[in-house]
């Protein structure tokens, strides 16, 4: 059956032979209506990429550099299955390219000019492409030929396989630049030996190199890693201090109509029958015909790449930056230490308009990028299409798991001038009901619920976390009869109460009328029994403070709070009747952009912050008539975090624990991708 067939692309006679064997052996173990293999032979991996894009083949396994080529237009392929190494219990699908130095040296990443460097080999990922790609814009001009620029940047190097005649400085630390193990400084162990022997000041290797070469922790402690933010960390902290994370070997397919489920079904069955130590007659991860045919011989199995993970996310910002710099050879005109405009990520149409107004008033220091959901915005910040946005704590958690960092906190209670330097304790997550109802925390089952959005703190993580510990399952849509929780599955009962309009029904952005704090409260006013919001929501939308037709006649005394002990209290008493304390919303950014974002925002709030009194004829950063566009409308200022500069420290141990527990109920495709 053609639609059940996976056309595998082979790049040599030997691969084609193994592919045919793969096809025949799969036929013998799979049912006739199951997936099947067909083999397509091409001259090179690039030809395979083109063939898949043109729908002449379906799949091929590629190294990271080729995954980058596959992702570029017009190919537009995406990773669908990853090979893993190591054990099934601790599968490794990535390695980290690192810069190792001796602990007793005193320079940082931005002080490598004039040092001596040790590389694994010319054109190799961890040893050359990544470090030189990331340093590319610091190299002296002209940057072509690249080897000459590198030779003029470092004071001496060992770059195995380089041309020692044309570029003698590249072979200064290893005469002749031998391209095999005859050169004592060749490859990973060689580059590390070059550093260890004192020939070089820095070695560009894999994170595992130092562990493979120094079994003794005391010996390893004589070395450190250089981080991209110009700090150093211990060699154990490579996950937080590396030049790039590099995927090892990946199966790619078309982004649209790519048969990814079928490819996974095929490979999952293949590893069950013909994986490591499974069969004598055919082995997926070895071959009598040659090395690394179709798959790497060192692979132990396959893992399905999460569907939300596109090639940009899979390869990572640093890796793509390095490869793009090398391939395109373009550098910004401004020096790299100068802050470029900050690209703010705006959620759908309304936020985009406010962002545009901010952009005009900032004289272009702020630029705007849009996405339809918060998770899409986070992904854009991760891959460099955007730089920053302000997020609810639930999304600060997801952003943090995706490698972003908190930069500034929204403060709601501290008057100026102390605001900027004050760390507030947070706000209260509350459950609001109509005073006329007889609801309590203990009889919510079967009622109609209103939530700010799935994944947000007051509207979801806190109430659903508490509910989970009571009901011990994730079927919240069965607990409530119906509700509006923007971001839920469209056919879920938790989208039934949403107001839309139609194509935007239940979407987690302002196009859904019941989205956010104000939206969830409106849902309660018009349709629901309980709303999960922040403690300020009722006062901010009653007594004529919200002039919208639905809100202008509402009275604060018509609403009450549910307390966890089963009692109810006035909305004026959130300190004595709340579900939990929630961390304030915070601005997040990529680590490399954090300082620029902080500097610019502190400057912008001095001009457009809460000191502006007349928002009808001036731009106000923290005002959008109860819509909470870009920032919460009750923000007084953006405050420095001081030492609370990681998502764990910012959110606090208790909240991180609560959200981690709720992860078993997670519907976040982005979180799944970021924890892959």
């Amino acid at each position: 059956v053609p639609e059940k067939s996976v056309r595998w692309c082979a790049v040599s006679e030997h691969e084609a032979t193994k592919c045919q064997s793969f096809r025949d052996h799969m036929k013998s173990v799979l049912p006739s209506n199951g997936p099947s293999v067909a083999c397509v032979k091409k001259a090179s991996h690039l030809d395979c990429i083109r063939a898949i894009a043109a729908n002449e083949a379906d799949a091929v396994t590629l190294d990271a550099g080729l995954v980058y080529d596959a992702y570029l237009a017009p190919n537009n392929l995406k990773p669908v299955v990853a090979e893993f190494y190591g054990s099934k219990e601790d599968p490794q699908t990535f390695y980290y390219a690192v810069a190792v130095v001796k602990k007793d040296s005193d320079f940082q990443m931005n002080q490598l000019r004039g040092r001596k460097s040790c590389h694994t080999g010319l054109g190799r990922s961890a040893g050359w492409n990544i470090p030189i790609g990331l340093l590319y814009c610091d190299l002296p001009e002209p940057r072509k030929p690249l080897e000459k620029a590198v030779a003029n940047f470092f004071s001496g190097s060992c770059v195995p396989c380089a041309d020692g005649t044309d570029f003698p400085q590249l072979c200064q630390l290893c005469p002749g630049c031998g391209c095999s193990t005859l050169n004592q400084y060749f490859s990973y162990s060689g580059a590390f030996k070059c550093l260890k022997d004192g020939a070089g000041d820095v070695a560009f290797v894999k994170h595992s190199t130092i562990f493979e070469n120094l079994a003794n922790k005391a010996d390893r402690d004589q070395y450190e890693l250089l981080c991209l933010d110009n700090t150093r960390k211990s060699v154990d902290e490579y996950k937080d201090c590396h030049l790039a994370r590099v995927p090892s070997h990946t199966v790619v397919a078309r982004s649209v109509g790519g048969k990814e489920d079928l490819i996974w079904e095929l490979l999952n069955q293949a590893q069950e029958h013909f994986g490591k130590d499974k069969s004598k007659e055919f082995q997926l991860f070895s071959s009598p015909h040659g090395k690394d045919l179709l798959f790497k011989d060192s692979a132990h199995g396959f893992l399905k790449v999460p569907p939300r993970m596109d090639a940009k996310m899979y390869l990572g910002y640093e890796y793509i930056t390095a490869i793009r710099n090398l391939r395109e050879g373009t550098c910004p005109e401004a020096p790299t230490d100068e802050c470029k405009p900050v690209k703010w990520c705006a959620l759908s149409h309304h936020e985009r308009l406010k962002c545009d107004e901010w952009s005009v008033n900032s004289a272009g220091k702020i630029e705007c990028e849009s996405a339809e959901t918060t998770e899409d915005c986070i992904a854009k910040i991760m891959n460099g299409e955007a730089d920053a946005m302000s997020l609810d704590g639930g999304f600060v958690y997801i952003a943090g798991m995706c490698g972003l960092v908190p930069v500034l906190a929204e403060n709601y209670n501290t008057p100026n001038p102390n605001c900027e330097n004050t760390a507030e304790e947070g706000y209260f997550a509350v459950a609001v009901v109509k005073s006329s109802s007889d609801l309590t925390w203990d009889n919510l089952k079967g009622k109609k619920s209103c939530h700010t959005a799935v994944g947000r703190t007051a509207g979801w993580n806190i109430p659903m976390g508490l509910l989970y510990s009571k009901i011990n399952h994730c079927r919240f849509d069965e607990f409530f009869s119906e509700g509006c929780a923007p971001g839920s599955e469209k056919n879920s009962s938790l989208c039934k109460l949403c107001m839309g309009p139609s194509p935007n029904l239940c979407e987690p952005n302002n196009k859904e009328g019941y989205y956010g704090y104000t939206g969830a409260f409106r849902c309660l006013v018009e349709k629901g029994d309980v709303a999960f919001v922040k403690h300020q929501t009722v006062p901010q939308n009653t007594g004529g403070k919200n002039p919208d037709a639905w809100a202008k006649n509402l009275k604060e005394e018509d609403y009450e709070l549910l307390c966890l002990d089963g009692s109810r209290k006035s909305v004026q008493e959130p300190a004595n009747c709340h579900l939990a304390r929630a961390p304030n919303h915070a601005v997040v950014a990529r680590k490399d952009k954090a300082d620029c974002v902080q500097t610019l925002l502190l400057d912008q709030q001095r001009m457009f912050g809460s000191s502006v009194t007349d928002c009808s004829s001036n731009f106000c950063l923290f005002e959008s008539k109860t819509k909470d566009l870009l920032f919460r409308d009750d923000t007084v200022c953006l405050a420095k975090l001081h030492d609370r500069n990681t998502y764990e420290k910012y959110l606090g141990e208790e909240y991180v624990k609560a959200v981690t527990n709720l992860r078993k109920c997670s519907t976040s495709p982005l979180l799944e991708a970021c924890t892959f």
């Epitope: 149409h349 309304h350 936020e351 308009l353 406010k354 107004e357 005009v360 008033n361 004289a363 928002c615 009808s616 004829s617 001036n618 731009f619 106000c620 005002e623 959008s624 008539k625 819509k627 566009l629």
Partner: nanobody, 117 residues
Amino acid sequence: EVQLVESGGGLVQPGGSLRLSCAASGSIFSIATMAWYRQAPGKGLELVAGITRSGSTNYRDSVKGRFTISRDNSKNTMYLQMNSLRAEDTAVYYCTDYSSRYYHDYWGQGTLVTVSS
């Protein structure tokens, strides 16, 4: 709320010029920021140029040096002078004010600019 009406569009050859006007039914003196947007066939709405109450301006990169935005508070009108027009400038052009703070979905009829030889 101020009502805005765009005019001045038309068919023009590449390299040609047009001046768009945006007339307000009420006073624009106190409006903090005004802007021109455009929407090309099958594309999303994009900010072309904006002007603050004090007259400072900002332009999208592709129109810098070719387009000039200005406002005349006494005539309650905003303008967009478009020079060196290119085929990719073909779009419906809308003016907006941000005064409502609702960042509304309400747009006028717009004025169509077609750049073609």
